[in-house]
Interface confidence: medium
């Protein structure tokens, strides 16, 4: 396994007062094995609201690498392959749960954290505000 | 506290052999406060690849209820508001971490699980296979 310099202030696993703490088995079970692993990997190029993927890395977090989508254009790609600014490319965002080492560098102590990630983009009709 | 019929096979928190077990503080920290999480709540109706949300419930999982996106059409909505079958609505999928009570009914013992959820839909150009 990985060797993490242990923080001397790491909480004691046996401490019954360690706040809201539960035992979690990190042998992660993946329920997705029966799904067709046809990842939506090429959708980012084929979409009418294409996106680029940016790597976000944090060694104190699990998962340590998260790929974030950034829409390539403000508008959407039309049938001619041009950007149509009458439509909008918008990120589809999702909150995900991650584990953060807390205190930092403690190998067996984590806190659940909610972070907002952009998963991909979709093309939407804009909301037009009419000025009276 | 809560009355849960306790499973006699619940693991002992002090058991050093309990596989890959860590202490997790479940006071979920929200990293999203500095952003204005403009919830993408209306995109599912405004998208050219609109989607419906379907309820998936599992009482032994947290969160117990997950609403999954299902694309409304095979094709995409064109400028006239009709479905264009020359384009495809496809789901954007993302793996998320959930907690599962394991063994079931043990109040303080969980397993991390990865599940694949459909977050929304995007409109893509189809892959056309030409028959020789």
């Amino acid at each position: 396994g990985i060797t993490i310099p242990r923080n001397p202030g790491c909480p004691n696993s046996e401490d019954k007062n360690f706040p809201r703490t539960v035992m979690v088995n990190l042998n992660i079970h993946n329920r997705n094995t029966n799904t067709n692993p046809k990842r939506s990997s090429d959708y980012y190029n084929r979409s009418t609201s294409p996106w680029n993927l940016h790597r976000n890395e944090d060694p104190e977090r699990y998962p340590s690498v998260i790929w974030e989508a950034k829409c390539r254009h403000l508008g959407c790609i039309n049938a001619d392959g041009n950007v149509d600014y009458h439509m909008n490319s918008v990120p589809i965002q999702q909150e995900i749960l991650v584990l953060r080492r807390e205190p930092p560098h403690c190998p067996n102590s984590f806190r659940l954290e909610k972070i907002l990630v952009s998963v991909g983009c979709t093309c939407v009709t804009p909301i037009v505000h009419h000025v009276a | 506290g809560i009355t849960i019929p306790r499973n006699p096979g619940c693991p002992n928190s002090e058991d050093k052999n309990f596989p890959r077990t860590v202490m997790v503080n479940l006071n979920i920290h929200n990293r999203n406060t500095n952003t204005n999480p403009k919830r993408s709540s209306d995109y599912y109706n405004r998208s050219t690849s609109p989607w419906n949300l379907h309820r998936n419930e599992d009482p032994e999982r947290y969160p117990s209820v997950i609403w999954e996106a299902k694309c409304r059409h095979l094709g995409c909505i064109n400028a006239d508001g009709n479905v264009d079958y020359h384009m495809n609505s496809v789901p954007i999928q993302q793996e998320i971490l959930v907690l599962r009570r394991e063994p079931p009914h043990c109040p303080n013992s969980f397993r991390l699980e990865k599940i694949l959820v459909s977050v929304g839909c995007t409109c893509v150009t189809p892959i056309v296979h030409h028959v020789a």
Epitope: V22, I92 | L26, N32, T33, N36, W67
Partner: antibody
């Protein structure tokens, strides 16, 4: 459709204890949270505390700490709120309310009350 | 604890008029603010969650906006059935707190 049905009105004497029930039907009781909110006559809403059955967590407002106990029984899908050392200031309508704890449209849809019980009127008088 | 202040305390409004209720938090609460309506002798009812997200079954004339410390509930075209007290509610940190309420009545 989620429904929360509370126990009936109570009349208590100062110093006594009170235990109100909130029976839930519909939805995953284990997965959602139940909070208790009270409203004194002519006053606003006051959060007392809540429970998340999935984790067995309870949270209490400091004001009620030591005097309130919130419990839940998964087998009967019922939450309870017990308040001890009653005084006339505890005369109020007590509501249970559901915190959905759902993952909806990409977000953890939690920490608000989408369904409420009908309220239990409690009068504390000597 | 986070203190929520609402203004106005009371508003008397003619039907079809626009009503604006503001809620200010004593610290940044992101968008963890919700709005409830309570009619006399009834339980509160959720109107808006997360500052601006509409609730299924709630008329579209109700809308919410804001983030951080300043929030607004707007009723576009008040109807007679909208009479009642409106509360804002923060769930950013424990203890959860409610605003003191804004009573709306129909002229």
């Amino acid at each position: 459709e989620v429904q929360l049905v509370q126990s009936g009105a109570e009349v208590k004497k100062p110093g006594e204890s009170l235990k109100i029930s909130c029976k839930a039907s519909g939805g995953s009781f284990k997965g959602y949270g139940i909070s208790w909110v009270r409203q004194a006559p002519g006053q606003g809403l006051e959060w007392m505390g809540g429970i998340t059955p999935f984790f067995g967590w309870t949270d209490y407002a400091q004001k009620f700490q030591g005097r309130v106990t919130i419990t839940a029984d998964e087998s009967t899908t019922t939450a309870y709120m017990e308040l001890s050392g009653l005084t006339s200031d505890d005369t109020a309508v007590y509501y249970c309310a559901r915190d959905p704890n759902e993952f909806w449209n990409g977000y953890y849809d939690t920490h608000h009350f989408d369904y409420w019980g009908q309220g239990t009127t409690v009068t504390v008088s000597s | 604890e986070i203190v929520l202040t609402q203004s106005p305390d009371f508003q008397s409004v003619t039907p079809k008029e626009k009503v604006t209720i503001t809620c200010r938090a004593s610290q940044n609460i992101g968008s963890e603010l919700h709005w409830y309506q309570q009619k006399p002798d009834q339980s509160p009812k959720l109107l808006i969650k997360y500052a601006s997200h509409s609730i299924s079954g709630v008329p579209s004339r109700f809308s919410g906006s804001g983030s951080g410390t300043d929030f607004t509930l707007t009723i576009n075209g008040l109807e007679a059935e909208d009479a009642g007290t409106y509360y804002c509610h923060q769930t950013f940190s424990l203890p959860y707190t409610f605003g003191p309420g804004t009573k709306v009545d129909i002229k």
